[in-house]
Interface confidence: medium
């Protein structure tokens, strides 16, 4: 259980470096944070330490009500503040692992 | 209504350093990112650092990275600038303003309070 | 960082004329545009935010246009109160914002 876990962390890590770069990895990025109402791996912060992710931006799929360009100059108060990897995580443990 | 006030300005010598004050009031406070911004005389508006909401995130302007560190006490609706290593040319007015972030500007801005670096 | 150029750099007119302020960034900020005024002793106050939109308790006389990297601050009939200095702001690359370097208004 504790190495599946590790693996995803190290996976959604992954697939945020990728998420510039790559349409298909951003819109299952997306659709994760969108579903699960989280924001990067461990929070919201991880998106700024993406080089290639503007510094004031995170996904629009962070933001609790999504519209083009929310994540663009966010507000804490406008985004889901927890981070994916423990909340998919949960679900995880609870109803496959 | 919404107020901020900024203390903690004066004259003090290169390479010293300063703490300024932003006393807030009149809004949520923690709703908000909060910015320093300065002016030196005559001159036009520098932007100078930011904090978030929580204070997870925090930037400089690079002509004061490494001197200066911006906080927040979201308990006493405060904002801090500390300045060391202060120099000549950061003699300005200095605000403290309020930002909604998005495309909204900054809204509310203090009165100012000046710093003077000079031997 | 994204470089915000106003012109012209000062201007004269009197009470009445319609008067434009410009505002150009190095590349394009869709509408994260600003703009204050600024009088003498004062801090700036917040005009236009969006490019177009007028900020709470902004006269009518003041509007605002553009997107991508061309942006104006009209005064459609000058009054005495509206001498003072105007600066545009991005805040599409944030940080750093950037300013404009002011366009003061003065009396002819």
């Known amino acids: 259980r504790d190495k599946v876990m590790s693996e995803f962390n190290n996976n959604f890590r992954q697939q945020m470096e990728n998420y510039p770069k790559n349409n298909h990895t951003a819109s299952i990025l997306d659709r994760m944070q969108a579903d699960f109402k989280c924001c990067g791996a461990a929070n919201y912060t991880d998106w700024e330490k993406i080089p290639s992710m503007s510094k004031n931006r995170v996904p629009d799929s962070c933001c609790i009500n999504v519209t083009v360009g929310c994540g663009i100059n966010f507000n804490e108060k406008a985004i889901h503040k927890e981070g994916c990897v423990e909340k998919i995580g949960g679900w995880l443990r609870k109803n496959v692992l | 209504q919404v107020q901020l006030v900024e203390s903690g300005g004066g004259l003090v010598k290169p390479g010293g350093s300063l703490r300024l004050s932003c006393a807030v009031s009149?809004?949520?406070?923690?709703?908000?990112?909060m910015n320093w911004i300065r002016q030196a005389p005559g001159k036009g508006l520098e932007w100078v650092s930011y904090?978030?909401?929580?204070?997870?995130?925090?930037y400089y302007a690079d002509s004061v990275k490494g001197r200066f560190t911006i906080s927040r006490d979201n308990a006493k609706n405060s904002l801090y600038l500390q300045m060391n290593g202060l120099r000549a040319d950061d003699t300005a007015v200095y605000y403290c303003?309020?930002?909604?972030?998005?495309?909204?500007?900054?809204?509310?801005w203090g009165q100012g309070t000046l710093v003077t670096v000079s031997s | 960082d994204i470089q915000m150029t106003q012109s012209p750099s000062s201007l004269s007119a009197s009470v009445g004329d319609r008067v434009t302020i410009t505002c150009r960034a190095s590349?394009?900020?869709?509408?994260?545009l600003n703009w204050y005024q600024q009088k003498p002793g004062k801090a700036p106050r917040l005009l236009i935010y969006?490019?177009?939109n007028l900020q709470s308790g902004v006269p009518s006389r003041f509007s605002g246009g553009g997107s991508g990297t061309d942006f104006t601050l009209t005064i459609s009939s000058l009054q005495p109160a509206d001498f003072a200095t105007y600066y545009c702001?991005?805040?599409?690359?944030?940080?750093?914002?950037?300013f404009g370097q002011g366009t003061r208004l003065e009396i002819n």
């Open positions: 303003v309020r930002d909604p972030r998005s495309y909204y500007g900054f809204d509310y």
């Open positions: 009149g809004f949520t406070y923690t709703d908000y990112f």
């Open positions: 904090i978030s909401n929580s204070g997870a995130i925090k």
């Open positions: 590349q394009s900020i869709s509408n994260f």
């Open positions: 969006g490019a177009s």
């Open positions: 702001q991005q805040s599409f690359s944030n940080p750093p914002v950037t």
